[in-house]
Amino acid sequence: YSHWPSCCPSKGQDTSEELLRWSTVPVPPLEPARPNRHPESCRASEDGPLNSRAISPWRYELDRDLNRLPQDLYHARCLCPHCVSLQTGSHMDPRGNSELLYHNQTVFYRRPCHGEKGTHKGYCLERRLYRVSLACVCVRPRVMG
Amino acid sequence: YSHWPSCCPSKGQDTSEELLRWSTVPVPPLEPARPNRHPESCRASEDGPLNSRAISPWRYELDRDLNRLPQDLYHARCLCPHCVSLQTGSHMDPRGNSELLYHNQTVFYRRPCHGEKGTHKGYCLERRLYRVSLACVCVRPRVMG
């Protein structure tokens, strides 16, 4: 992520004194962390990342906002309306639907802060719940009662 | 979430002047936001939330840390080693594996802040990547080359 101060008084302040420091932990990138580079098609691969091998395969779509933390979010997009056959991985089985799994993720937006008299006092972080689609899941269709 | 000040100088400060304010948006709870109340078993239901209808069904396990934002995270736990048959919703199909989908989520930990001379200056938020399991996905097994 590009760096931006998170609680920054309008007067300059040494970074060592920032009330909010960001430190990124080096963690090996996990499969959903970035888009799938394999060909995007409605088939379940026998290798590659989880979203390619799934019988409800999906791709990732980047959602970037430089005034938000995290700045980069990825939304899953299903590649098939139905699930792919476990037998072949290449033809659809209409007995199953490929459905998006949604999640309300906590994100933080950078907003101007205002003091008691409405003066600009730097930036504040505003917490929001942001809907992201995490993956596509093969489900049995709902039975309408 | 319970409220705790996020950038709090050691001296008391009016909440309106807090550099970092949290505001929660009322968003309708989505399926993965809380544990499944349906019976936990290795079967794909024809109703209920996505994690019950999936042919790779899962339950949610609460992970609570009051010094972290979000304080509550849920980890998916697969209920079956293989996928459930689309035909019956109850028999396992050994041609598919139920695998966890992992994600490195950005979280924030509350840590004591120290000033230039090592004095305690309140609390800082430390950004970390935290591995969470989002869901269980039905995949074709990897073919070993």
């Epitope: 476990l86 037998q87 072949t88 991985g89 290449s90 033809h91 | 109850s90 199909d93």
Partner: antibody, heavy 121, light 113 residues
Framework: QVQLQESGPGLVKPSETLSLTCTVS????????WSWIRQPPGKGLEWIGY???????NYNPSLKSRVTISVDTSKNQFSLKLSSVTAADTAVYYC???????????????WGQGTLVTVSS | DIVMTQSPDSLAVFLGERATINCRSS????????????LAWYQQKPGQPPKLLIY???SRESGVPDRFSGSGSGTDFTLTINSLQAEDVAVYYC?????????FGGGTKVEIK
């Protein structure tokens, strides 16, 4: 009665591309899955891959990088291309219909008579 | 891939006697949800293409003489030819269609003793 007939060159040079066509009669190619299977002289059977009229294909991983199966619904034909051939690709090549039920592929029936392709310079 | 192993490689039987061919899969080809074994048997006579005899491990294809029967489940299967006839001289193959890649056994040659 469904009948299949393979056609194509009987001799291919090493490193070149083997090309065969299967002509289907007695059934519409659009209603079934169609497959290629080969049999080296005096040896067993090896499945190469299948195709559906929509173009949906599935190939044997052992040959995947070299195989292309295509379909021509207007001619009621499907074809096999196998690139970069070697002597090990010398075989009788059969085309066959794949039975399909309950959203799954089943057995092969019927088969074409087969055509021998020899890879040699 | 599922490896199909046939035994014996060849078999010589007197006319009118029983011939038994075995086929073993490296993993189960039985699916509990439909109670079926995804296994077929073929007969191949010299200079001819294979001909389907048995599907779902034990269902005889129409037109196939009833002296041919298939049995077994999971990983172990048998093709039995009761009262072997001269026209049964051929190579017999088992094939799994449980999962792609679809695979065949190495074949068993049946001859008259």
């Amino acid at each position: 009665q469904v009948q299949l007939q393979e056609s194509g060159p009987g001799l291919v040079k090493p490193s070149e591309t083997l090309s065969l066509t299967c002509t289907v009669s007695g059934a519409s190619i659009s209603n079934y899955y169609w497959s290629w299977i080969r049999q080296p002289p005096g040896k067993g059977l090896e499945w190469i891959g299948y195709i559906f009229y929509s173009g949906n294909t599935n190939y044997n991983p052992s040959l995947k990088s070299r195989v292309t199966i295509s379909v021509d619904t207007s001619k009621n034909q499907f074809s096999l291309k196998l690139s970069s051939v070697t002597a090990a690709d010398t075989a009788v090549y059969y085309c066959a219909r794949v039975r399909f039920s309950d959203y799954e592929l089943n057995w092969f029936d019927p088969w074409g008579q087969g055509t021998l392709v020899t890879v040699s310079s | 891939d599922i490896v199909m192993t046939q035994s014996p490689d060849s078999l010589a039987v007197f006319l009118g006697e029983r011939a038994t061919i075995n086929c073993r899969s490296s993993q189960s080809v039985f699916l509990g949800s439909n109670n079926k074994n995804y296994l077929a048997w073929y007969q191949q006579k010299p200079g001819q293409p294979p001909k389907l005899l048995i599907y779902w491990a034990s269902s005889r294809e129409s037109g196939v003489p009833d002296r041919f029967s298939g049995s077994g489940s999971g990983t172990d299967f048998t093709l039995t030819i009761n009262s072997l006839q001269a026209e049964d001289v051929a190579v017999y193959y088992c094939q799994q269609y449980f999962i792609t890649p679809l695979t065949f056994g190495g074949g068993t040659k049946v001859e008259i003793k």
